[in-house]
């Protein structure tokens, strides 16, 4: 996972409906000058990406870890 | 009846704030972001920035970002656009528009806005 | 800051005859391109999204086609109802900029 940024908010909808073991990828995207809040996409195993509230509890934690330290690109 | 239906005109002193309603109806508000765009007269047109509907969280250009808030009421499906520190540059025709609809699958081919209000005159003057 | 430039400033024609309005972006906006008509004292209407998709309730012949930074609307036969103003808009990034705007005018 990396701190990443997008050029406008990707995300105007959120789900929390996913298993953790669906996951293959997430995509932290950064509060930023394009887009005032935190996203987070994930890339499932099936192929498809979706949009995940960063305030899920099994995703904060995780959060948290990439953005205070994670591999950061811009 | 798919619409979005502003507040009416508003005469303000410079200085002074004007809030700006639009009423979103007959259709899915989380599913679109609204946008704000002003037009002075005989101008073009100008993106104030837009708010999430669902999280209510804004954007905003830069060149209004100390001036404008922008603020939604989902229990009336309500957006609302105040600027302060108004002086004569800012009059203008204030619109709302909507832009969507996107679902929580995350889009890079975005839509073009489809719905607009009918828009609100601010006059600033002393 | 994204900026997009429109040409021609005013475009003098007949009814009946094709026009053909220019719309380039300062650097990529992929087909993030949009065309909205407005006509005096009206709000700006979406004609084309996406560069070329159409939208429900516009006449055909109205389209739109383009990438990267140059993109074109074309109004393949002119009627009475199109003499306005023309301006493209991008979303690809935030923020949200519009042309200067093309005045459709009889000639």
């Known amino acids: 996972a990396a701190v990443l940024r997008e050029l406008r908010c990707v995300c105007l909808q959120t789900t929390q409906g996913v298993h953790p073991k669906m996951i293959s990828n997430l995509q932290v995207f950064a509060i930023g000058p394009q887009c005032s809040k935190v996203e987070v996409v994930a890339s499932l195993k099936n192929g498809k990406e979706i949009c995940l509230d960063p305030e899920a509890p099994f995703l904060k934690k995780v959060i948290q870890k990439i953005l205070d330290g994670g591999n950061k690109e811009n | 009846q798919v619409q979005l239906v502003q507040s009416g005109a508003e005469v303000k002193k410079p200085g002074a704030s004007v809030k700006v309603s639009c009423k979103a109806s007959?259709?899915?508000?989380?599913?679109?972001?609204i946008h704000w765009v002003r037009q002075a007269p005989g101008q073009g047109l100008e993106w104030m920035g837009n708010?999430?509907?669902?999280?209510?969280?804004?954007n905003y250009n830069e060149k209004f970002k100390s001036r404008v808030t922008m603020t939604r009421d989902t229990s009336t499906s309500t957006v609302y656009m105040e600027l302060s520190s108004l002086r004569s540059e800012d009059t203008a025709v204030y619109y709302c528009?909507?832009?969507?609809?996107?679902?929580?699958?995350?889009?890079?081919?975005?839509?073009?806005?489809?719905?607009w209000g009918q828009g609100t005159l601010v006059t600033v003057s002393s | 800051e994204i900026v997009l430039t429109q040409s021609p400033a005013t475009l003098s024609l007949s009814p009946g005859e094709r026009a053909t309005l220019s719309c380039r972006a300062s650097q990529s906006i992929s087909n993030n391109l949009h065309w909205y008509q407005q006509k005096p004292g009206q709000a700006p209407r979406l004609l084309i999204y996406?560069?070329?998709r159409s939208v429900s309730g516009i006449p055909a012949r109205f389209s739109g086609s383009g990438s990267g930074t140059d993109f074109t609307l074309t109004i393949s036969s002119l009627e009475p109802e199109d003499f306005a103003v023309y301006y493209c808009g991008q979303n690809n990034e935030w923020p949200e900029v519009f042309g200067g705007g093309t005045k459709v005018e009889i000639k």
């Open positions: 528009a909507r832009e969507g609809p996107y679902s929580y699958y995350p889009s890079r081919q975005y839509y073009g806005s489809d719905l």
């Open positions: 007959g259709y899915e508000f989380t599913s679109y972001w």
């Open positions: 996406y560069t070329s």
């Open positions: 708010i999430s509907p669902n999280s209510g969280s804004a």
